[in-house]
């Protein structure tokens, strides 16, 4: 499956947190979403291959690595000034 | 900052095997990319050798494949290169080198190479 | 295999000339996911290859803006819009959508 964390977090200001995403599906391609209240899914960075990935809708605030197949963190930086959000990863084929 | 350093004989008798070691400082090679080895012969052009990934699977170039094992010391945070029944064709610069974050499988941390000589 | 060709294998130019090098692949280099796998690197004698242009047209960080990538399917190009002197040396493209990896013979570029 794929397995998201932490559930909740808060952030201090100035900080930079980062989200763990791993799955073990042998998926090559990893997603990260936002989800702000009444809206829908905005794409921030997604990754097709380990060690590449591609900024999405709205990547400014965000960064993003791609060690392994089977992980790829998002780290909310002390640039996002508006990170209060629901965050998703998804992966695929 | 990723660093790499290869190590092992520079003079290598024909038939025989060809080892090389790979030192990498500055980040561990269990947690992810690949690590590859590529060699150029004196005043040519380079040849990619193949790789070990972060979990140990290999990929190899075919023109090589029969002859060519790379494996790993974790403990020592080492990757190693052994070439089979070795010939004069084999003398080279071999580097070490890791991919740099972001771009793919193309590689941008190197050894500083070191020349082996296959010769009687 | 890839082959990758460049041309000219040799050129001769002069600090401040406009200089293209050309490398062309016998496959397509648009990987399965959409993505172009075509770098450059610089080499200069005794030293290891130093890497200037990732996937067709993204300077690598520290590369000067003289150096540009463009092209696409088979065909590719690096740019130096002005030799500076440290530009002599010799260029490699290389792929890394298939496997194996590979690279072109290298143009040397030398002063004139």
């Known amino acids: 499956g794929i397995t998201q964390s932490p559930k909740y977090l808060f952030r201090k200001e100035g900080q930079n947190v980062t989200l763990s995403c791993e799955q073990n599906l042998n998926h090559d391609a990893m997603y990260w979403y936002r989800q702000d209240p009444g809206q829908g899914l905005r794409l921030i960075y997604y990754s097709q291959i380990v060690n590449d990935f591609q900024k999405g809708d709205i990547a400014e605030g965000y960064s993003v690595s791609r060690e392994k197949k089977e992980s790829f963190p998002l780290t909310v930086t002390s640039a996002q000034k508006n990170p209060t959000a629901f965050y998703l990863c998804a992966s695929s084929i | 900052q990723v660093q790499l350093q290869e190590s092992g004989p520079g003079l290598v008798k024909p038939s025989e095997t060809l080892s090389l070691t790979c030192t990498v400082s500055g980040y561990s090679i269990t947690s992810g990319y690949f690590w590859n080895w590529i060699r150029q012969p004196p005043g040519k052009g380079l040849e990619w050798i193949g790789y070990i990934s972060y979990d140990g699977s290999n990929n190899y170039n075919p023109s090589l494949k029969s002859r060519v094992t790379i494996s790993r010391d974790t403990s020592k945070n080492q990757f190693s290169l052994k070439l089979s029944s070795v010939t004069a064709a084999d003398t080279a610069v071999y580097y070490c080198?890791?991919?740099?974050?972001?771009?793919?499988?193309?590689?941008?941390?190197w050894g500083q190479g070191t020349l082996v000589t296959v010769s009687s | 295999d890839i082959q990758m060709t460049q041309s000219p294998s040799s050129l001769s130019a002069s600090v401040g000339d406009r200089v293209t090098i050309t490398c062309r692949s016998s496959?397509?280099?648009?990987?399965?996911?959409?993505?172009?796998?075509l770098h450059w690197y610089q080499q200069k004698p005794g030293k290891a290859p130093k890497f200037l242009i990732y996937?067709?047209?993204n300077r690598f960080s520290g590369v000067p803006s003289r150096f540009s990538g463009s092209g696409s399917g088979t065909d590719f190009t690096l740019t130096i819009s002005s030799l500076q002197p440290e530009d002599f040396a010799t260029y490699y493209c290389s792929q890394s959508t298939h496997v194996p990896f590979t690279f072109g013979q290298g143009t040397k570029l030398e002063i004139k």
């Open positions: 080198a890791s991919p740099s974050p972001g771009t793919g499988y193309a590689v941008d941390y």
């Open positions: 496959q397509s280099l648009v990987h399965s996911n959409g993505n172009t796998y």
């Open positions: 996937k067709v047209s």
